[in-house]
């Protein structure tokens, strides 16, 4: 079944290569287990950046080695991507799946364009 997911159109990464945004999905109702996947679209290719499953009983938990962190509250997930560089500029799509109990719902946002500007190296001082 289809479900709406919303995310901001544009986000500018910090000078440290960190970008955060909220992914909000149509009310989870009685969803007990939710999977959030961050996808990066480059041209026609879509690659998975990170993913996490959380339950209404627990916090959002990405793998320790993940480039993402996040927190969940109701039907909103605050996602943070770290280690971004200029070549990481692109469209980042939030995908939300209501996994359990049935029925299964899936929703995808329209994507957030993340702009990453590598910091200029400090000029040598005389």
């Amino acid at each position: 079944k289809g479900m709406h997911a919303a995310q901001p159109a544009v986000v500018l990464a910090s000078s440290r290569g960190v970008a955060s945004f909220v992914c909000e999905y149509g009310s989870s109702g009685n969803a007990a287990e939710v999977r959030v996947t961050m996808l990066r679209q480059a041209g026609s290719q879509m690659t998975e950046v990170c993913a996490a499953t959380y339950t209404v009983e627990d916090e959002l938990a990405f793998l320790d080695d993940s480039t993402c962190t996040g927190t969940s509250s109701g039907n909103k997930v605050n996602l943070t991507i770290q280690g971004l560089r200029a070549m990481g500029t692109g469209l980042y799509i939030c995908k939300v799946e209501l996994m359990y109990p049935p029925p299964y719902y899936v929703g995808m946002g329209n994507g957030t364009q993340i702009y990453v500007i590598d910091p200029e190296p400090c000029p040598d001082s005389d």
Epitope: S27, S28, G29, N30, V56, E57, P101
Partner: antibody
Framework: EIQLVQSGGDLVKPGGSVRLSCKAS????????MNWVKQAPGKGLQWMGW????????TYADDFKGRFTFSLDNAKNTAYLQINSLRAEDTAVYFC?????????WGQGTTLTVSS | DVLMTQTPLSLSVSPGEPASISCRSS???????????LEWYLQKPGQSPKLLIY???NRFSGVPDRFSGSGSGTDFTLRISRVEADDAGVYYC?????????FGGGTKLELK
Amino acid sequence: EIQLVQSGGDLVKPGGSVRLSCKASGYTFTNYGMNWVKQAPGKGLQWMGWINTYTGEPTYADDFKGRFTFSLDNAKNTAYLQINSLRAEDTAVYFCARRSIYYPYWGQGTTLTVSS
Amino acid sequence: DVLMTQTPLSLSVSPGEPASISCRSSQSIVYSNGNTYLEWYLQKPGQSPKLLIYKVSNRFSGVPDRFSGSGSGTDFTLRISRVEADDAGVYYCFQGSHVPWTFGGGTKLELK
């Protein structure tokens, strides 16, 4: 404190109807599905079905399709189990239970006796 | 429907001794997301059931580590490493993977 308080159990004649209540407190009622479980005297637990407290959509186990109806009053944080055309075999303790990925919270159970 | 078969129907154990209860499902209870929603509950006379184990092997908060769950696919086991007087009651397995969700028939544990 999260609580499920049940009421409505009674001695009812065969052919009659009954409505059992399950009042929830201590959490957001519409965030969790409410399930109903039957336990006949001296018998095990039998899953009757559940109702999505957000959408109001019920799901019934095959043995409980027809005479059994799950309903809600979200303003009162209460789930109901209505049983029509009562039979002797409906005599049981009925439990409501809140489910997420498990049942951590149960009502105390309410006893329904169907007898003439 | 998924039939959950528990064995034994009853067992009598001395305090301090281990106990083991088996639960077998008539088909795999792995849900479409890869999880197995297999739980264990203990019901004492005149009381509501209490959750012990969820998702096969996860102990619910406050449950003593004497209780452990294991298994996969269709075969599951609840183990009590050292039985105590408070453990007496009827144990039920439950599958929440395939609707209609179903309970096992129960296993009565009594102390010698």
